[in-house]
Interface confidence: low
Amino acid sequence: TIQGTNRSSKGRSLIGKVDGTSHVTGKGVTVETVFSVDEFSASVLTGKLTTVFLPIVYTIVFVVGLPSNGMALWVFLFRTKKKHPAVIYMANLALADLLSVIWFPLKIAYHIHGNNWIYGEALCNVLIGFFYGNMYCSILFMTCLSVQRYWVIVNPMGHSRKKANIAIGISLAIWLLILLVTIPLYVVKQTIFIPALNITTCHDVLPEQLLVGDMFNYFLSLAIGVFLFPAFLTASAYVLMIRMLRSSAMDENSEKKRKRAIKLIVTVLAMYLICFTPSNLLLVVHYFLIKSQGQSHVYALYIVALCLSTLNSCIDPFVYYFVSHDFRDHAKNALLCRSVRTVKQMQVSLTSKKHSRKSSSYSSSSTTVKTSY
């Protein structure tokens, strides 16, 4: 049996040893680097937090996020005639969510099976890259959307092709930036075999030499550049937006807009409080603790924060709802199992019968559908 060098290894906070041991396979004896983890790490990797709580949350995110973002993308691409900058940003937001959420069945299976990754190195890297990529894409597209919403209130000029082209350019630049900043996640070996638990982890255990310095520097840079700066822009946009709305006209129409804008602000604030702030803060604190103390005491909080960050895929549809008239129509009718065409026909028929009030209702077998939106 070949025994390798004993270098200390730490996972996200998982402390142990690298043991270059012979691992017997069907094809004979192959030498590979295997990791032994300490009992704290084992308790996390075998405990209910990772094997029960995480898959439950990820299942909810998948069940809610896949259809809602799928519908949103379809609405923005094929059911929205005018491609306003807001529509472009929301379409990208929905695409980012979908690219992350489609891998969740593998993530759920991984956690349910005791954090055992059986799908190969490449898929693990894709999953992790898309996981973090989605979070940072969401932050950036949300920032663009927030700044754009403020801009619309300040300059309520009509839709121009030039503005749409700028939005497309910005979106492509964001995708390119995210691709570049997540390259380290695709390059680093993310799967580690732990014989003590007879599992292969995906991202949960990482080599110390990579982890201690590099991971702290990496996530600190991302937290400053792709979280704090966009968060400041978003907050500024909303503070200015609230000021503008407070001094604007108080008619019914503007009141509706004001309420929707407030709901959008509350939704985005909730997303920052639940999804983005805890995860970015704890990513930095967690890796700082490992770097400075050799152990992270916030590991459980860190896992919960990263898990909650995926809820942005469930919260984003609320943003679409408050911003997009078309998505609102399709969402309402999807929930009522009606096609938009049917409702439009109802509206036409009612209008022709001189029901020209601002909000008329169509009643049929105890179901009331508001026909003006």
Epitope: D19, H23, V24, D38, E39, A42, A196, N198
Partner: antibody
């Protein structure tokens, strides 16, 4: 019920190889790790090495150059081989079972006394 | 290698007396494990994960500590507690034991 039983020679010549067998019953070697621990007369316990459920091994760095642990899952046996024995290797050799989690030896064999002497 | 230093090496206690054994690690360990061994018998798991009692262990036994300093306590010594107690770490290979503390009845 769970049992571990060590077997092997009671006396070994210096510079020779020690071969011990730990025969287990009441559990599967693919579900539990098995470790070897020794105890020289009147002294403390020394962890020697472990064979994990997956079949790979980890050793005490002081012994790894002359120690080898293997197993036969079909026979429910774990083997210890240690070469170049010296008189200071005289000890009671125990095999002990450890689960995936929590980490502790919940069952031990009764031990086999091995004397290294010419 | 993490070296575990137990103190005292030997200890004599009267029935009803409180007994404390300490175990210091040369570097930080996540948890400490304790085993009891009576003369001529195999060791038995006594305390795992620093403070959890193994099955069948009376609740007069307790464990505590963190980092590099851990302790094992018997709140009220009883005759059957006379044995040698070993601390053990699973934090990194080699998974070392302490030299042991021999607890005798006074």
């Amino acid at each position: 019920q769970v049992q571990l039983k060590e077997s092997g020679p009671g006396l070994v010549q210096p510079s020779q190889t020690l071969s011990l067998t730990c025969t287990v019953s009441g559990f599967s070697l693919t579900n539990y790790h098995v470790s070897w621990v020794r105890q020289p007369p009147g002294k403390g316990l020394e962890w020697m090495g472990i064979i994990w459920t997956g079949g790979s091994t980890a050793y005490n760095s002081l012994l790894k150059s002359r120690l080898s642990i293997s197993r036969d899952t079909s026979k429910s046996q774990v083997f210890l081989k240690m070469n170049s024995l010296q008189t200071e290797d005289t000890a009671t050799y125990y095999c002990a079972r450890r689960g995936l989690y929590p980490y502790y030896f919940d069952y031990w064999g009764q031990g086999v006394m091995v004397t290294v002497s010419s | 290698e993490i070296v575990l230093t137990q103190s005292p090496t030997t200890l004599a206690a009267s029935p009803g007396e409180k007994v404390t054994i300490t175990c210091r690690a040369s570097s930080r360990v996540s948890n400490m494990y304790w085993y009891q061994q009576k003369s001529g018998a195999s060791p038995k798991a006594w305390i795992y994960e620093t403070s959890k009692l193994a099955s069948g262990v009376p609740d007069r036994f307790s464990g505590s500590g963190s980092g590099t300093s851990y302790s094992f306590t018997i709140s009220s010594m009883e005759t059957e507690d006379a044995a040698t107690y070993y601390c053990h770490q699973w934090t990194s290979t080699p998974y070392t034991f302490g030299a042991g503390t021999k607890l005798e009845l006074k």
